[in-house]
């Protein structure tokens, strides 16, 4: 079938990095500057994508391959592709309509991206608190009560959580 | 092509203004947040303001709120921010960006930047 295919079409035979020429009797030329294409038989080149503004290039484009971008420092990658940048917010913090804000009391959020989270509720396991919960910080749950000899532990049971703030606000 | 113009920067006096403008084509500017962006010499990209598609929700990053005013004229494909009481901390290049598409709802992702107009406050 390729052979087949071969004979008909002689696209067939151009190679990634090159294009089938229509104005020069299907002849396959290379990709000219600033294109390429990933696959044979191509009857265009397609134009590399540029990686401008808050985009930094990550990977060149070549006559096979598009370029790659990412984000500048202090904004991260978003969709298919790093088709978005987006901010940075401080660890503790929440990215919202009004920008970087503070996770409110009895959340956290331990990356400079997504949204602040509640801290776990220890007893629901049963299980009591032996480390505070910060803004940054979940909570660590330690055994519970019952597995302690009585008056041994001075750990307080935790505050209950609250909803966290949902980015965006 | 898709493209966003900055213009309107300069030096200007403490407790000045400037009215910087971005002027987008190549896109319906009218289905877009638009979102202003700056970065002070040796710092940093900072937010500055964003405003939604209809120009009916605006935000402003606190040193900013009460002093600038972002808006746009969709009939027009231009984005604007109205800044007054500048002071020393304000120079900084400003960028205009395009929110990408779900921006505000389930994102902050911008897919399309201007290349700057230079701010100077200075006496």
């Known amino acids: 079938f390729e052979r087949t295919r071969s004979l008909q079409d002689p696209c067939s035979n151009c190679p990634a990095g090159t294009f089938c020429d229509n104005n020069r009797n299907q002849i396959c030329s290379p990709c000219p500057p600033n294109s390429f294409s990933s696959a044979g038989g191509q009857r265009t080149c397609d134009i590399c994508r540029q990686c401008k503004g808050v985009f930094r290039t990550r990977k060149e484009c070549s006559s096979t391959s598009n370029a790659e971008c990412d984000c500048t420092p202090g904004f991260h990658c978003l969709g298919a592709g790093c088709s978005m940048c987006e901010q940075d917010c401080k660890q503790g913090q929440e990215l919202t309509k009004k920008g970087c804000k503070d996770c409110c009391f009895g959340t956290f959020n331990d990356q400079k991206r997504g949204i602040c989270r509640p801290w776990t509720n220890c007893s629901l396991d049963g299980k009591s608190v032996l480390v505070n919960g910060t803004k940054e910080r979940d909570v660590v749950c330690g055994p519970s009560p019952a597995d302690l000899s009585p008056g041994a532990s001075s750990v307080t049971p935790p505050a209950p959580a609250r909803e966290p703030g949902h980015s965006p606000q | 092509e898709v493209q966003l113009v900055e213009s309107g920067g300069g030096l200007v006096q403490p407790g000045g203004s400037l009215r910087l403008s971005c002027a987008a084509s190549g896109f319906t500017f009218s289905s877009h947040w638009m979102t202003w962006f700056r970065q002070a010499p040796g710092k940093g990209l900072e937010w500055v303001a964003h405003i939604k598609e209809d120009g009916s929700e605006k935000y402003y990053e606190d040193s900013v709120e009460g002093r600038f005013t972002v808006s746009r004229d969709n009939a027009k494909n231009s984005l604007y921010l109205q800044m007054n009481s500048l002071r020393a901390e304000d120079t900084a290049v400003y960028y205009c960006?395009?929110?990408?598409?779900?921006?505000?709802?389930?994102?902050?992702?911008?897919?399309?930047w201007g290349q700057g107009t230079t701010v100077t406050v200075s006496s």
């Open positions: 960006a395009r929110g990408g598409d779900g921006y505000s709802d389930s994102h902050f992702g911008v897919d399309v």
